[in-house]
Interface confidence: medium
């Protein structure tokens, strides 16, 4: 399928001009290669009319140009002084020949309808309203005013000043005058449909002295706005329907042959295909709202329509806005797993992609909630503190420069199952959605900490050990101290690393962390985890309480921990005042200040796929073949 996209059908009238925009994928080659516009003949040949190399055909001389906009990945063909001879089939495309990548465009030029010379033309979109201005002479001020619609042989009354109204205009037509001006009356017709199109006559007075004015009302289906988006990226439909429908229910639907199937509305309806990846956000009191869809799929391409009606469903005669969405399969957004599986008590590490050109952007992780219009409260961010209910079990690790940041969630429960979004305050296309599935654990966890009831005594030495299976032998083990700004990695000692790499004794694989001397600030959550380079794997968490020594007793660490960790000389002492490297939290988490919600996401986040490296079906992380370096972490 060609990745070039443009308008399928372009229509205009004789003498007017058109502007045709064609989109191409964001690559250096595409930005610099030849762009062309050609006309398709009966033989299948496509004859160039204009190209970015400077070619201009005789028939377009003086009335057409082609402009490339590499920063937008678009080029535009402008054609003026259209005639019905311009009606035909065309291609816009890229390449050195006209057989390159292209998109078919049908251009249709209609004749201008013949109208009486003094006709005033009003052009309106379906569902909108029109106010027709009808001037008259002062002597006709006391006379009857009326508006009628011309049919072939007669003029059918729409409304008059004696309050007569045609049944098909009841509740839609109003005849009025403004202030003290006695030389003009107005007729307003609302909820316009195609049926309202045609010729009208305003009249004041009767007989030869009557004032008459011809009016031509054109009611058009709005031209669809073109949206060119990458596979797995996100799209925002910005819908502006006007103040008159501000209080009506809003909807977004997708055209399906004769009908428009509602995808989401403000009354709570949502298509299951969009579960976890859609939000509808009322913008203001002027009838504006937006719909955000992340994780675009091939099948999302198509014709969309937004509108407003009390039913939350499409209704004739109500304003609409339309889009044609093209999903480019040559996506720059990496293909990641969209479902991550974890087990109760276990952990998941979710790799969130972001635009590598924006490594300094603020990173966020939010949980999609489908109630109401859908919203996504931020749970953690590079400058957003972890939400209280996730204390000790959620952290974001930013790895500047490599296009990925990692979110780790441990102590999983079935309540954690659901949809989550990775997003930044930068390139909104890189908004990704992952579904977290949590199954009941059927076996012991891979990582176990001893002692399990960890209480350290002030001023003494305290050691905790993390046991790991042989399959993690070659991976890097770490301990980190959790705070609501992240998890700060601490020096630790890997017992297993000293063994021969040929055999692996399951009982002696452990990584220890020592606090010496214990201070009150050491109280809190600690994580033990494994990672391979910048790829984070499983974690487990433990809360260490700190208490004062009770009189007449000395505190002893549980023997099972010390039995495996009698390497005091080799263990590194952790100074409890280690400075934390993370960004300090700020009260306002960037663009999502309101209740930390990604509600008005408009166009500032994107897409959905995740690679939960620690989250395969059985809770294991990816194995690694890299050599383990024998040193203290």
């Amino acid at each position: 399928k060609s990745p070039i996209f443009g308008p399928q059908e372009v229509s205009s009238i004789e003498g007017d001009s058109v502007s045709i925009t064609c989109y191409y994928p964001d690559t250096s080659v595409n930005r610099h290669t030849r762009k062309y516009w050609c006309r398709q003949g009966a033989s299948g040949m496509c004859t160039t009319l204009i190209s970015s190399n400077g070619y201009l055909s005789k028939e377009y001389s003086g009335r057409a140009n082609l402009i490339n906009f590499p920063e937008n990945n678009t080029f535009v063909i402008n054609i003026e002084q259209l005639t019905q001879d311009d009606t035909g089939s065309y291609k816009c495309g890229l390449g050195t020949s006209n057989r390159g990548l292209s998109f078919d465009v049908s251009l249709e030029v209609s004749q201008v309808p013949e109208l009486p010379s003094d006709t005033h033309v009003y052009t309106k979109d379906i569902g909108r309203n029109v106010t027709i201005e009808c001037p008259f002479k002062r002597e006709n001020a006391p006379s009857k005013k009326s508006l009628c619609k011309k049919t072939n042989q007669s003029c059918e009354l729409v409304i008059d000043s004696t309050e007569k109204v045609n049944p098909s205009y009841i509740g839609r037509a109003k005849l009025f005058m403004k202030g003290t001006d006695l030389t003009v009356f107005y007729v307003n017709i609302s909820h316009l449909t195609h049926n309202d199109a045609g010729l009208y006559i305003c009249q004041a007075g009767e007989g030869p002295s009557a004032d008459k004015k011809n009016v031509d009302l054109q009611v058009l289906a709005p031209e669809p706005e073109l949206l060119y988006k990458d596979l797995r990226s996100s799209v925002t439909f910005e819908c502006d329907l006007g103040r008159e429908v501000a209080n009506e229910a809003k909807y977004l639907c997708r055209m399906n042959k004769e009908t428009c199937d509602v995808i989401i509305n403000t009354l709570g309806k949502r298509d299951p295909d969009f579960e976890g990846r859609i939000l509808i956000t009322p913008k203001d009191d002027n009838g504006r709202f937006s719909v955000l869809i992340t994780g675009l799929r091939k099948e999302d391409a198509g014709h969309y329509q937004c509108g407003a009606h009390s039913s939350g469903l499409p209704q004739e005669g109500w304003p609409i806005q339309t889009w044609q969405l093209f999903v480019n399969e040559e996506s720059t957004i990496p293909n990641r797993r969209s479902v991550v599986k974890g087990v109760t008590g276990g952990s998941v590490a979710i790799a969130c992609p972001y635009n590598p050109k924006e490594s300094s952007s603020l990173k966020y992780w939010c949980r999609w909630e489908g109630d109401g219009n859908g919203h996504c409260p931020v749970l953690v961010g590079t400058q957003a503190q972890v939400q209280e209910e996730y204390e000790g079990r959620l952290a974001l690790f930013d790895q500047p420069g490599n296009g990925t940041y990692t979110v780790i969630l441990n102590q999983l429960t079935t309540e954690d199952a659901g949809f989550y979004w990775c997003l930044t305050n930068g390139d909104s296309r890189w908004r990704t959605t992952i579904e977290l599935q949590v199954a009941e654990a059927t076996r012991e966890p891979n990582l176990e900490v001893t002692p399990q009831n960890a209480t350290a005594v002030l001023g003494e030495t305290f050691t905790v050990s993390c046991h790991y299976p042989c399959k993690f032998y070659s991976q890097e083990k770490y301990w980190c101290k959790w705070s609501n700004k992240g998890c700060h990695i601490l020096p630790s000692h890997d017992e297993g690393a000293r063994q021969s790499s040929v055999s692996c004794d399951q009982s002696s694989q452990l990584v220890s962390m020592t606090l010496n001397p214990v201070s009150k600030e050491d109280e809190g959550w600690y994580w033990c985890g494994v990672k391979q380079g910048q790829t984070y794997g499983e974690t487990t968490a433990i809360y260490i309480a700190v208490e004062e020594r009770t009189r007449g007793s000395s505190h002893v660490n549980p023997t099972d921990a010390n039995a495996r960790a009698k390497v005091a000389l080799e263990e590194e002492v952790v100074d409890s005042s280690i400075s934390e490297k993370e960004n300090k939290a700020i009260p306002n988490p960037g663009p999502f200040a309101n209740e930390r919600e990604i509600q008005n996401v408009g166009d500032q986040a994107q897409e959905n796929r995740a690679s939960g490296d620690a989250g395969s079906a059985d809770g294991q992380s990816r194995s690694s073949s890299s050599k383990h370096h024998h040193h203290h972490h």
Epitope: S110, E114, L115, N195, G198
Partner: nanobody
């Protein structure tokens, strides 16, 4: 380009019925973006509007002379538009043309951009 082909014309008696069909083909990217209409031209007269139908069939319009006797319908799945003519009169004798437009407009102001070749309807008394 769009090709419009009419069919169904013929010779009938006054009071009879006839059904004209118009099939759209060629590069019709989506038939439902065209408003459709029927016009007719009697010998020695100008072409006149008969009936029109909007994109999805929601709105129709008729010349006063055929109101109540003629019905226009469309089937977007089949790219066809039909004119059902009942109680035919000798005055209905003409060549009937199918037409399409990008804008739906009622009556004579229907802005045609494609015409069919026409089909002859003759009503004898």
């Amino acid at each position: 380009e769009v090709q419009l082909v009419e069919s169904g014309g013929g010779l009938v008696q006054a009071g009879d019925s006839l059904r004209l069909s118009c099939a759209a083909s060629g590069r019709t990217l989506s038939f439902d973006t065209y408003a459709m209409a029927w016009f007719r031209q009697a010998p020695g007269k100008e072409r006149e509007f008969v009936a029109s139908i909007d994109y999805n069939g929601g709105s129709t319009d008729y010349a006063d002379s055929v109101k109540g006797r003629f019905t226009v319908t469309r089937d977007n799945a089949k790219n066809t538009v039909t004119l059902r003519m009942n109680s035919l009169k000798p005055d209905d004798t003409a060549v009937y043309y199918c037409a399409s437009a990008r804008y739906y407009r009622s009556g004579t102001s229907f802005p045609v951009n494609y015409w069919g070749q026409g089909t002859q309807v003759t009503v004898s008394s």
